[in-house]
């Protein structure tokens, strides 16, 4: 309706003697400015004054001046806009109409507001959600509909009184559309918190109590138990009766369904709060509890572990580890069920009681050949002796034994024969599958752990075998002490240390390298005839004539063998020289004769001088002398000189003579 | 025993935003609440939000408009998302479990995860 | 908000000595909170529900306090006491914080 003025405002609020009033409020006038307002408590309209009448709690006038009796209440408001109030403090006879009466040039308007003031301050309000179920967090909210800027407030939280321990919001609205304080507590209820009591505390700015409002908390919960066991300390002996009592000490809501259950699997036809549980066996023990469900869930109680006693079960033994390797460390444990826990053991190996061995477990730290067998244990507790069970068997694992290489042959062996060996050993675990012998060779393997050596060689000294399974164990080497016919004879010199001049002491060495057996016997030879029999041939003096082929021979009792043929070289100076006239010594005059210098001589002669029987040297130096055409004059005894590195040596006088040839006869 | 660990990628670009995990052991996500704290270098401790068992959140006003909180509770997970980060956002981020479901004080803190905001 | 104001923010002190320090709250807080943190550390919860000692704690500390004021007290300090304190309050969120006092050795 546009004849209508539009006012905004809570429509009644609310406040407590002693405490204020704030009216949030706007408006729009028909027309124009705000030219006079009176805010009138419960007021009514006078039809004969057309006028309203009622207290006239605020008024202001043209000129804007109020008068001093009215600072109670307050128009914070202006002349077009605004029309808030605040009354402070507030009594109880505020409560009622509160009358806004409004005009401008040319209208007027009366707004009503309802005004609602208790003696005492009202409590606030606790809404809670429709369900609260354990864990799952809720928002508890305070409403109280009261707010104003000059009566600071608190709302707190109190769970049985004491102050809440989670944090709140706390908000507060001063709206045309509502006035309110309001605290959220946002917490997670635990079944523990069913039927408590929660309250929201109104207080004042310094934590003075003003009012509160109360709720019992309703958490929804899975039934929560307590199991009781007899005996108490669920420990009995089989035969022994249990009886087991689940109680239920909060459900919300009721229970429904009531179950036992053994190591998490349900008990058939157990249905009822007690659990009788006669002559027990000891398949019995284990982890008992209760279930029991509500619309919510399913609740456990907490485990009771039953232990039903019994005297210890045929042992087992469990070996870490088998087989065992030779050396290493070996754990055994006896396995035995039995409750309480065997105190006591008894350990056999092979049958016969192991002395000081009484725990669970054996320790051998360094396992040897022997330890193999059988072992076996017997457990004791309190209720008796078990049995002894088949035991478990170590299998110690070791390389092979003793290992050593055999010769097969008769001794002794020679160089060129065959040879048989074989490798042999005194135990093994695995079984030996291979053998390897050094040095390696062509050789043949005719069967598993035998070599055969065909020609065995000189220089086949030593051999070694090895036996294998999951390791190799090597024999000492074994010598075969092959013999042989001395080997490498050879003629050594020994002196002189430089070439052989006649005349010199010669030594010459028959050596060789080795020779198995070691002793032999020595022949020197030259031209096939023997000169002696010791390992040296010595020249006192040596000439010209000892040279030649020598050999040595060394022989012992597998055989002989000679040097190579060693050439014995003497140098010396020319010797036996002479001087050889061909044709002959007689040459007729005119012919050519041809004068030799002959000589022996090492090395041979170098250079020739020729004399003649005046000793006058000629010039001529090579080995012949060739006159042509031959004259009378010469006539004469010649001589020849050779020269060696050795030395000189001459000839003897030869005498040429030339005869007149016939012409020269006849012209004479 | 219960335990929190952080993870987080150490440094971010400025206006970047940051992701953050905390893995917890020794107790159940959907029983408590999970915490988010910071602290500046050389500075004091900030709370930022938290996760509630049944995974509703509450954030701190002041950086509501930014934060994220989320959970896997099967995998032990609790993430931190915040956007549009600035060189002022440079701290150690902690996540922290209260002595009780929802209350009581910080009984555990995870190590922390220092996070660098720079070009 | 409410703002959690610790006083001293530095304290040094001997070992030996009594050790107090205090955290004065804008509006009144149910219950104060006490951490106790060094370098390098996460922080550690000491005291809850303003006089309870978290587990592990020495009894040399203790806390106290209501409404709007509380405080920490170390009996006698310990050379391993030093450290920076922080006081946190769980009435209203946002949850707070003070800004510390840090704990020194003379």
């Known amino acids: 309706d546009s004849s209508k003025w539009v006012f905004e405002h809570p429509e009644t609020l609310y406040a407590w003697e002693g405490a204020c009033v704030w009216i949030p409020c706007t408006y729009r006038a028909l027309d124009g400015d705000l030219e006079s307002f009176i805010l009138f408590h419960n007021p009514e309209y006078n039809k004969n004054t057309s006028k309203f009448d009622g207290t006239r709690l605020y008024e202001s006038t043209k000129d804007g001046k109020v008068p001093s009796e009215q600072k109670r209440v307050q128009f914070l408001g202006d002349k077009n806009k605004n029309c808030t109030l605040s009354i402070h403090p507030v009594h109880l006879n505020d409560s009622g109409q509160l009358g806004l009466r409004m005009e401008s040039k040319t209208e007027k308007w009366m707004e009503r507001i309802h005004l609602n003031v208790s003696e005492r301050p009202f409590p606030p309000h606790i809404q809670l959600p429709p369900e609260i179920q354990e864990s799952q967090e809720v928002t508890l909210t305070c409403l109280l509909n009261f707010s104003c800027y000059g009566y600071p407030i608190q709302l707190q939280w109190l769970l049985e009184g004491v102050p809440m321990r989670q944090a709140a919001v706390t908000s507060t609205s001063l709206t045309i559309k509502s006035v309110f304080t309001r605290s959220e507590l946002k917490f997670s209820p635990q079944w523990s918190h069913h039927g408590k009591i929660v309250t929201c505390q109104l207080q004042d700015a310094d934590g003075k109590f003003l009012s509160n409002d109360t709720v019992q908390l309703n958490v929804k919960h899975t039934p929560k138990l307590e199991i009781k066991v007899t005996p108490s300390d669920a420990i009995v002996r089989e035969g022994d009766s249990v009886t087991m009592t689940c109680e239920v000490s909060s459900s919300n809501p009721e229970y429904t369904t009531v179950s036992w259950l053994k190591d998490g699997t349900s008990l058939k036809k157990q249905n009822t709060f007690t659990l009788n549980l006669r002559e027990v066996t000891k398949d019995q023990s284990g982890k008992y509890c209760c279930q029991v469900s509500n619309d919510v869930g399913p609740g456990r109680s907490e485990e009771v572990f039953l232990q039903v006693q019994y005297a210890p079960e045929p042992s087992t033994v469990q070996i870490l580890h088998s087989p065992a390797v030779e050396g290493s460390q070996v754990e055994f444990l006896c396995m035995s069920l039995a409750n309480p826990l065997p105190t006591n053991y008894t350990w056999y190996h092979n049958g016969k009681e192991m002395q000081g061995r009484t725990e669970e477990k054996v320790h051998i730290p360094k396992i040897l050949p022997w330890h193999a067998g059988t072992y076996s244990c017997v457990a004791e507790n309190i209720l008796g002796t078990g049995q002894r069970g088949p035991g478990a068997e170590l299998d110690v694992q070791y390389p092979p034994k003793k290992v050593t290489t055999v010769i097969q042959n008769p001794m002794p062996i020679r160089e060129g024969d065959t040879v048989t060996l074989s490798c042999n050993y005194n135990s093994s675990n695995p079984s030996v599958t291979r053998y390897e012998w050094k040095p390696h060779g062509a050789w043949e393997e005719p069967s598993l752990g035998v070599l055969k050596i065909q020609n065995v060689g000189w220089d086949n000294t030593t051999i070694a075998c090895a036996a294998c399974n999951s390791w190799c164990s090597w024999a000492s080497p074994v010598a075969l002490n092959v013999q042989y016919a001395p080997r490498d004879v050879r003629v050594r010199k020994i002196k002189p240390l430089s070439e052989i001049h006649s005349g010199n002491s010669v030594s010459l060495q028959c050596d060789f390298s080795s020779s198995h057996p070691k002793e032999v016997q020595f022949f020197w030879e030259k031209n096939g005839r023997l000169l002696g029999k010791e390992s040296q041939l010595n020249f006192d003096s040596i000439s010209p004539e000892d040279a030649g082929s020598y050999s040595c021979w060394v022989n012992n009792s597998i055989g002989q063998t000679a040097s190579k043929a060693w050439t014995l070289e003497v140098l010396y100076a020319p010797r036996r020289l002479r001087v050889s006239m061909s044709p002959g010594d007689q040459v007729m005059e005119g012919k050519s004769a041809t004068l030799t210098c002959e000589s022996d001589a090492n090395p041979p002669v170098s250079h020739y001088t020729w004399f003649d029987w005046n000793n006058q040297s000629l010039p001529y130096h090579s080995q012949k002398l060739r006159l042509e055409p031959v004259k009378v004059q010469h006539s004469g005894a010649y001589w020849c000189q050779g020269t060696n590195s050795v030395g000189k040596g001459r000839s003897p006088l030869s005498t040429l003579t030339v005869y007149y040839s016939p012409e020269t006869i006849g012209r004479r | 025993q219960v335990q929190l660990k952080e993870s987080g990628p150490g440094l971010v670009a400025p206006s970047q935003s940051l992701s953050i995990t905390c893995t917890v052991s020794g107790f159940s996500l959907s029983r408590y609440t999970v915490h988010w704290v910071r602290q500046p270098p050389g500075k004091g401790l900030e709370w930022l939000g938290m996760i509630w068992g049944g995974g509703s959140t509450d954030y701190n006003s002041a950086l509501k408009s930014r934060l994220s909180i989320s959970k896997d509770n099967s995998k032990s997970q609790v993430f931190l998302k915040m956007n549009s980060l600035q060189t002022d956002d440079t701290a150690m981020y902690y996540c922290?479990?209260?002595?009780?479901?929802?209350?009581?004080?910080?009984?555990?803190w995870g190590q922390g995860t220092l996070v660098t905001v720079s070009a | 908000q409410i703002v959690l104001t610790q006083s001293p923010a530095i304290l040094s002190t001997s070992p030996g000595e009594k050790v107090t320090m205090t955290c004065s709250a804008s509006s009144r807080v149910n219950y104060m909170y006490w951490y106790q943190q060094k370098p390098g550390s996460s922080p550690r919860l000491l005291i809850y529900?303003?006089?309870n000692l978290a587990s592990g704690v020495p009894v040399r500390f203790s806390g106290s306090g209501s409404g709007t004021s509380y405080s920490l007290t170390i009996s006698r300090m310990e050379a391993e006491d030093a450290a920076t304190y922080y006081c946190?309050?769980?009435?209203?969120?946002?949850?707070?914080f003070g800004a510390g006092t840090k704990l020194e050795l003379k």
């Open positions: 529900d303003t006089s």
């Open positions: 922290a479990r209260p002595h009780d479901f929802d209350a009581g004080g910080f009984a555990y």
């Open positions: 946190q309050q769980w009435t209203s969120y946002p949850l707070t």
